[in-house]
Amino acid sequence: EINGSANYEMFIFHNGGVQILCKYPDIVQQFKMQLLKGGQILCDLTKTKGSGNTVSIKSLKFCHSQLSNNSVSFFLYNLDRSHANYYFCNLSIFDPPPFKVTLTGGYLHIYESQLCCQLK
């Protein structure tokens, strides 16, 4: 297992919510991405391929998410101060083998200006 801080901007704020960006290498074809808050699994997304190169996307812990060819974005809405925490992208790579797990993360700071429904 490889652990480390994200070397990219992991948190993108908009409209009282946050997009948490979890990147993976372009070469990865089949994987599971979990978003962890502390040690708790908040969201997950698994991408696998069929014999005809059809793709299956599954979530056991569903969050609004967006998949690209090198990242999964998880969206958290209605931010409040309780969202401030360490968040981790837990990537399990199935294909290409061999199986490996990488963990990258960062701290989500919540500032007044980022909170939902602020009275201006």
């Epitope: 069929g50 014999s51 059809t54 299956s56 083998p97």
Partner: antibody
């Protein structure tokens, strides 16, 4: 212990039909892509076709040599794979193997011992 | 459809010899190539997958290399129990086997 046991082989006339079965045990059958592979006497291995898992809507794919004549199906509740062979030709004579493969999260590959199909008049 | 060719079709070598088999795909298959061993009257056995990864329980004298269209399978020191036919198989797009290489002892 993983086991794949093929049955249903035998002698059939050209133009006839036969249904092969493959009973699986010792692994989670529903998670595996299931293939049929055949081997004519004294020849090499030839892929026949595959049926994917429920996640992929049990999609089936076939080699050009059998497309339109052979049909693969599966019954996950019975851990059984089937090969329905119609319009059989003498060149379909072979040992038919069922094989199970998975790539997620680790790569596994299991084979049965095969069942002989002879197409002859 | 992806075609696979293999060479040689047969070879004889002495115990302890290094044996090399080559496999060529008709188009780029990345590293989605397996090698199988088949002994007479038996089902094939997976030795190597994803070009160079050893299947569970396979001795380290077996190895594989290559990428794209050209691949190599090597037995570093041939043993009597290695007498068999060896097949490459692409799994980039469905499955296709090579024609096989029969290996025996001199």
């Amino acid at each position: 212990e993983v086991q794949l046991v093929e049955s249903g082989g035998g002698l059939v006339k050209p133009g006839g039909s036969l249904r092969l079965s493959c009973a699986a045990s010792g692994f989670t059958f529903s998670d595996y892509f299931m293939h049929w592979v055949r081997q004519a006497p004294g020849k090499g291995l030839e892929w026949v076709g595959v049926i994917d898992t429920k996640s992929f809507n049990y999609a089936t794919y076939y080699s050009d040599l059998v497309k339109g004549r052979f049909t693969i199906s599966r019954d996950d509740s019975k851990n059984t794979l089937y090969l329905q062979m119609n319009s059989l030709k003498t060149e379909d004579t072979a040992v038919y193997y069922c094989t199970a493969t998975i790539a997620v999260p680790y790569y596994f590959d299991y084979w049965g011992q095969g069942t002989l199909v002879t197409v002859s008049s | 459809d992806i075609q696979m060719t293999q060479s040689p079709s047969s070879l004889s070598a002495s115990v302890g010899d290094r044996v090399t088999i080559t496999c060529q795909a008709s188009q780029d298959i990345s590293n989605y190539l397996s090698w199988y061993q088949q002994k007479p009257g038996k089902a094939p056995k997976l030795l190597i997958y994803y070009t160079n990864l050893l299947a569970e329980g396979v001795p380290s004298r077996f190895s594989g290399s290559g990428s794209g269209t050209d691949f190599t399978f090597t037995i570093s020191s041939l043993q009597p129990e290695d007498i068999a036919t060896y097949y490459c198989q692409q799994y980039y797009n469905y499955r296709t086997f090579g024609p096989g290489t029969k290996v025996d002892i001199k």
